[in-house]
């Protein structure tokens, strides 16, 4: 039975040209995290595998930095980066946990962080 929950940074906003940290955290389970995949709609951003290290998709290589931890730093933001991002935790023996983050990239300088929330 899957008992864990994914806590994410929730709905967040950031300024065009700036950077943002996409972060998820798996709690309430003793399952071992073997890999975390980061995706945006139908595109893979990055993979962090416990044994194999990081894979960064070529389309994001210039502006994605691994970390901190299992998170992802997205740099040089454009309005096209607005949308849903998913952290997919592959664990043993539980299976897969998915967290969702919505990022809005703003033209103005009024970018505020949304509240943290949990996805069971």
């Amino acid at each position: 039975m899957m008992t864990g929950t994914i806590e994410t940074t929730g709905n967040i906003s950031a300024e065009k040209g700036g950077s943002i940290i996409l972060q998820c955290h798996l709690s309430s389970t003793t399952a071992q995290v073997t890999q975390v995949n980061w995706e945006q709609q139908d595109q893979l951003l990055a993979i962090c595998n416990a044994d194999l290290g990081w894979h960064i998709s070529p389309s994001f290589k210039d502006r994605v930095a691994p970390g901190p931890g299992l998170g992802l730093t997205l740099q040089s933001l454009t309005v096209n980066d607005t949308g849903e991002y998913f952290c997919i935790y592959h664990t043993y023996p539980d299976g897969t946990y998915t967290g969702r983050i919505f990022l809005e990239v703003l033209e103005s300088s009024v970018a505020e962080h949304g509240a943290r929330f949990q996805i069971p």
Epitope: T34, N37, E39, N49, D51, L52, H55, P58
Partner: antibody, heavy 115, light 106 residues
Framework: EVQLQQSGPELVKPGASLKISCKTS????????MHWVKQSHGKSLEWIGG????NGGTKFKGKATLTVDKSSSTAYMELRSLTSEDSAVYYC????????????WGQGTSVTVSS | DIVMTQSHKFMSTSVGDRVSITCKAS??????VVWYQQKPGQSPKLLIY??SYRYTGVDRFTGSGSGTDFTFTISSVQAEDLAVYYC?????????FGGGTKLEIK
């Protein structure tokens, strides 16, 4: 020039163990993950596992044990309790910096398990 | 484990033709797909990575797809393209390969 030079062909008896080497040159060994891939005669490819030299240590993947020697930029795969099912060509291959695609491959080591 | 299915074990084509090889994943693999070419008696060679990115010096080859369905295309087949072509996913370990498609030149 990047090179992955594997050890020569092997003929071993069932139940025996075997260690295959993959000596690398032309790049910084610790910056790339090393993988091992099996190809049985006339068959497809099967990924055995990979080892990140930076993390060092030993990786156990079924009957295979993957190790690295950073001082000689060499990767090793030991196969235990060999059976005829293990007769195959084994390749080492590296995956790139921040990329999982295996961009350079060794020439392969042919292993025959027969009594 | 994710199963990568290449429905055609063999494909026959002529020099100059355009040919497409398909690969279907048993579950979502996003764009974490690679294509390799293996000529008789040789090691596999990387052609396409991250589903659609050409590796150095492989101009006639293109890849496309996302999710579960992927296609590898040779725009104008040459005699030296006689080989087996494999798709492989690295979305999740264990990484898995398709069964291969052998390209035969008429």
């Amino acid at each position: 020039e990047v090179q992955l030079q594997q050890s020569g062909p092997e003929l071993v008896k069932p139940g025996a163990s075997l260690k295959i080497s993959c000596k690398t040159s032309g790049y910084t060994f610790t910056e790339y993950t090393m993988h091992w891939v099996k190809q049985s005669h006339g068959k497809s490819l099967e990924w055995i596992g990979g080892i990140n030299p930076n993390n060092g240590g030993t990786k156990f993947k079924g009957k295979a044990t993957l190790t690295v020697d950073k001082s000689s930029s060499t990767a090793y795969m030991e196969l235990r309790s060999l059976t005829s099912e293990d007769s195959a060509v084994y390749y080492c291959a590296r995956s790139g910096n921040w990329d999982y695609a295996m961009d350079y491959w060794g020439q392969g080591t042919s292993v025959t398990v027969s009594s | 484990d994710i199963v990568m299915t290449q429905s055609h074990k063999f494909m026959s084509t002529s020099v100059g033709d355009r040919v497409s090889i398909t690969c279907k994943a048993s579950q979502h693999v996003s764009t974490a797909v690679v294509w390799y070419q293996q000529k008789p008696g040789q090691s596999p060679k990387l052609l396409i990575y991250s589903a659609s990115y050409r590796y150095t010096g492989v101009d006639r080859f293109t890849g496309s797809g996302s999710g579960t369905d992927f296609t590898f295309t040779i725009s104008s087949v040459q005699a030296e393209d006689l080989a087996v072509y494999y798709c492989q996913q690295h979305y999740i370990t264990p990484w898995t390969f398709g069964g291969g498609t052998k390209l035969e030149i008429k």
